[in-house]
């Protein structure tokens, strides 16, 4: 008799999930000498322990604490780049500007980036068929709780000037329901963070509007100001040129507005 299995609305665990996590862990320690003390087998065990045999709608931040401890990492607190709905450009930027870090440039973010995972209550199986969707099923699912946990810790670690890259092509440039809007903004520490600087990335070639005047950006400014953190905003009209100028700042065309 086939065992009844809960059918969730979201995609199942990424295929070869355990192997992917282990391989990424080894790769990360290869690239980052300061993390070579990391025991990837223990990392996988801690990762697995956070969700295996647990109901995938009943995951807590506490479940991820052993993994958080193993992945403890010091990044320069004044070199943090947050992003919302514009991950690819943010990652392209930190690949060029090597002294700045997104969450996915840290070990834990790197391990989980673009992956999905969940287990089943009372069995040691990984569910490759389906996992809970944040909206349709439940918010306390393994993936959402993981990102909430690491995002909170990442924001808490930030200091001085924190940058955030926002997608100017979205109807809500700043979305209160995004991870940035619901977690990171509220976990920046006013006693450490002086300024949040938003970079609004324009999508259209001929888009010359000042998107820093967008109502959602004003809403972000209000939230940040109420937290006793200064706010500044820059339009990035030409993201392609912006990246090019990060690569080659001496280029004569890089003195004009980008």
């Amino acid at each position: 008799v086939p065992r009844w299995r809960q059918q969730w609305s979201g995609p199942g665990t990424t295929k070869r999930f355990p192997e992917t996590v282990l391989a990424r862990c080894v790769k990360y320690t290869e690239i980052h000498p300061e993390m070579r003390h990391v025991d990837c087998q223990s990392v996988w065990d801690a990762f697995k322990g956070a969700f295996i045999s647990k109901h995938p709608c009943n995951i807590t931040e506490e479940d991820y604490q052993p993994l958080m401890k193993l992945g403890t990492q010091t990044v320069p607190c004044n070199k943090i780049l947050l992003w919302s709905r514009i991950k690819d450009l943010a990652h392209q930027f930190t690949q060029v500007q090597r002294d700045m870090f997104t969450l996915e440039d840290t070990l834990l973010g790197y391990l989980a980036d673009d992956l999905t995972w969940c287990g089943e209550f009372n069995t040691s199986k990984i569910n490759y068929q389906s996992c809970p969707d944040w909206r349709k099923d439940c918010s306390n699912n393994p993936v959402s709780v993981f990102w909430k946990t690491v995002s909170r810790r990442f924001a808490e670690a930030a200091c001085d000037v924190v940058h955030v890259m926002l997608n100017g092509s979205r109807s809500k440039i700043f979305d209160k329901n995004s991870t940035f809007g619901s977690v990171e903004v509220h976990n920046l520490q006013p006693e450490k963070v002086q300024t949040l600087e938003a970079w609004v990335i324009h999508g259209g070639r001929e888009d010359s509007r000042d998107l820093c005047q967008d109502p959602t950006i004003k809403e972000l400014e209000s939230i940040i100001s109420k937290r006793n953190i200064q706010f500044s905003c820059k339009n990035i009209y030409r993201p392609d040129k912006f990246l090019q100028c990060v690569k080659n700042p001496e280029d004569s065309s890089c003195t004009s507005e980008i």
């Epitope: 080894v26 290869e30 070579r36 990391v38 025991d39 990837c40 223990s42």
Partner: antibody
């Protein structure tokens, strides 16, 4: 088949510099993810980790001994070296080298047979 | 530094017995603990890493368990060739540190 073999002076006097060599085969430090470490064991006593070096020349030392230790490698000749400055009788021990591998943090899986070093005036 | 404490310096056993050796870390090392066997005149031999993973070629009578600060190494049925000194080591952080060792001897 990975094999490691330590060699040293056998005996030396206090205040001298101890030079140790670890020669290995079946292992290449030009291969990403490999490393070699040094551990010592005074006769009848426990083990003490000293230092290790990775393929890309990243080095780690035991903080208690760091000022006296220098680890280096010669990738082409498959050798790792350890120098201990200003030795004392407390440095009398069997010295082992061992392999480490990325991803298993500092788990030393293959060990040499050890070389005995006596510091005596 | 993380101190690894093996409470028993010696343990007496008989062939066929089940024996467990304990090791306590002075702070949480999650599961980053290895166990080594050392026979007289020989170098240490890796048996267990990451608390519970048996190294290649190690007989399955050897097992490891534990997490956090308390770790146990077990031989399910002691053989004559198992009489040796057993060391635990934390591979969680530098400096790597070892327990003082537990010598397994015949009753």
């Amino acid at each position: 088949q990975v094999t490691l073999k330590e060699s040293g002076p056998g005996i030396l006097q206090p205040s001298q510099t101890l030079s140790l060599t670890c020669s290995f085969s079946g292992l290449s430090l030009s291969t990403s993810g490999k490393g070699v470490g040094w551990i010592r064991q005074p006769s009848g006593k426990g083990l003490e980790w000293l230092a290790h070096i990775w393929w890309d020349d990243d080095k780690r030392y035991n903080p208690a001994l760091k000022s006296r230790l220098t680890i280096s490698k010669d990738t082409s000749s498959n050798q790792v070296f350890l120098k201990i400055a200003s030795v004392d009788t407390a440095d009398t021990a069997t010295y082992y080298c061992a392999r480490i591998e990325l991803g298993r943090s500092y788990v030393m899986d293959y060990w040499g047979q050890g070389t005995t070093v006596t510091v005596s005036s | 530094d993380i101190v690894m404490t093996q409470s028993h310096k010696f343990m007496s056993t008989s062939v066929g017995d089940r024996v467990s050796i304990s090791c306590k870390a002075s702070q949480d090392v999650i599961t980053s603990v290895a166990w080594f066997q050392q026979k007289p005149g020989q170098s240490p031999k890796l048996l267990i890493y990451s608390a519970s993973y048996r190294y290649t070629g190690v007989p399955d009578r050897f097992t490891g368990s534990g997490s956090g600060t308390d770790f146990t190494f077990t031989i399910s049925s002691v053989q004559a060739e198992d009489l040796a000194v057993y060391y635990c080591q934390q591979h969680y952080t530098i400096p790597l540190t070892f327990g003082a060792g537990t010598k397994l001897e015949l009753k």
